[in-house]
Interface confidence: medium
């Protein structure tokens, strides 16, 4: 029988060389192995690139699409074939559906007497348009702690945050994870950062323990 | 760091025909763009006269097509213009390029060029 | 064929004075290029895709448009920016430039 797309294509852009398109099909389909997506570039001399989608899930696949670059103008072409049935054609413009890509390398730096600093990359290159548009979502949760989750908004383009060691708890371990949107882009959030984990040893000056314990 | 240079016999008589040779150093003609030749006349106009790409496809300026050829030799990493039948309105500086299939149309690399004048 | 028509055709402006100068088609067109070109020199990619700055090309220099009107903006000119602008578009063959604007210092 025929194959059908029961989803559509959805892609995303990471706005810098790989666009990932996920979609679903009618029924239990072997993606690699019973389909291509055919992409290219609205231009006048671009040639047509092939995708081979990979499984996600028993009716689910999804494609990476390798893209020299991306301008703001760009449009592709999209043509999902299976054999010699074209079972979709759309288009997709990557500056309009980006997600970034999610920030890198997460270190918190305890050294400091009385702060924790964590610090990370941004994922971009300086000379790509969201390296300087990138802000960021810092989640720190503690595992001992299960009721302790807070989310901090980074809005200032260096990626840092500092947080008062004394408004986490001393003895227990915490973890952070970041991820990071484009607001000029009105982009979807990245994927979490892997998340890192340390442990919160300070302990406030005597003088400020005895002053709490007695209030 | 990808070069080219073009080379060629500098003077043309009227009615002749026109060869010139880029060599591309750095880089496979072979591995990816469109190769150029573009001119620009005594007063600045740019003229894009067509290309080889790297597949070797080719493609000319319609007002050139009558007369114009653009072949290439991969084994020396070279491309070649011959333009049949010169008049002095072919005097100009050619230039090689290549760029164009992968980069929007945007040409990186050109030659120095080279100065051609078509006079009996 | 698709023209383009570059405007002023000569631009003069005083060292830190911004000057922009336009590039007009008479069909719409994806992508516009810009290169500089100083005397006996070839011409240098300078903006690449309407807005996007190529190698080495300092940050007071800008692009921007879409469809048929596409425009380079200088924010504060300097002596080494004395040189003929071009655009160029590939949205159709055959491929064409603009006529240039030549920038002069005061």
């Known amino acids: 029988g025929s194959m059908k797309v029961l989803q559509e294509p959805a892609c995303v852009s990471d706005y810098m060389s790989i666009s990932t398109c996920e979609w679903k099909m009618g029924g239990p389909t072997n993606c690699s192995a019973e389909l291509r997506l055919l992409y290219q570039l609205v231009f006048q001399s671009s040639e047509t690139h092939t995708c081979v989608p990979e499984n996600n899930g028993g009716v689910g696949c999804v494609c990476h699409l390798l893209m020299d670059d991306v301008v703001s103008m760009d449009n592709y072409t999209l043509d999902l074939w299976a054999g010699q049935q074209l079972l979709w054609k759309g288009s997709f413009k990557p500056s309009e559906h980006v997600k970034p890509r999610a920030p890198g390398n997460l270190t918190v730096h305890t050294n400091v007497s009385d702060t924790v600093l964590l610090t990370w990359s941004n994922p971009y290159p300086p000379d790509n348009y969201l390296y300087n548009d990138l802000t960021y979502a810092v989640n720190i949760w503690s595992e001992n702690d299960p009721a302790y989750s807070r989310i901090h908004n980074v809005t200032y383009l260096k990626p840092t945050l500092r947080i008062p060691a004394s408004t986490l708890k001393s003895g227990i371990s915490y973890r952070a994870r970041v991820r990071a949107w484009a607001q000029h882009y009105n982009t979807t959030w990245s994927e979490w950062s892997p998340s890192t984990k340390w442990y919160n040893s300070y302990r406030e000056p005597f003088e400020q323990r005895h002053h709490h314990h007695h209030h | 760091d990808v070069q080219l240079q073009e080379s060629g016999p500098g003077l043309v008589k009227p009615s002749q025909s026109l060869s010139l040779t880029c060599t591309v150093t750095?880089?496979?003609?072979?591995?990816?763009?469109?190769w150029n030749w573009i001119r620009q006349f005594p007063g600045n106009k740019l003229e894009w006269m067509g290309y080889?790409?790297?597949?070797?496809?080719?493609s000319y300026n319609p007002s050139l097509k009558s007369r114009i050829s653009i072949t290439r030799d991969t084994s020396k990493n070279q491309f070649f213009l011959q333009l049949n039948s010169v008049t002095t309105d072919d005097t100009a500086t050619y230039y090689c390029a290549g760029g164009g299939l992968r980069r929007r149309g945007l040409f990186d690399y050109w030659g120095q060029g080279t100065t051609l004048t078509v006079s009996s | 064929q698709i023209v383009l028509s570059q405007s002023p055709a000569i631009l003069s402006a005083s060292p830190g004075e911004k000057v922009t100068m336009t590039c007009r088609a008479t069909?719409?067109?994806?992508?516009m290029h810009w290169y500089q070109q100083k005397p006996g020199s070839s011409p240098k990619p300078w903006i690449y895709a309407t807005s996007n700055l190529a190698s080495g090309v300092p940050a007071r220099f800008s692009g921007s448009g879409s469809g048929t009107s596409y425009s380079l903006t200088i924010s504060r000119v300097e002596a080494e920016d004395t040189a003929t602008y071009y655009c160029q578009q590939w949205s159709s063959i055959p491929l064409t430039f603009g006529a240039g604007t030549k920038l002069e210092l005061k």
């Open positions: 080889i790409s790297y597949s070797g496809s080719s």
């Open positions: 069909s719409s067109v994806t992508y």
């Open positions: 750095g880089y496979s003609i072979t591995s990816d763009y469109a």
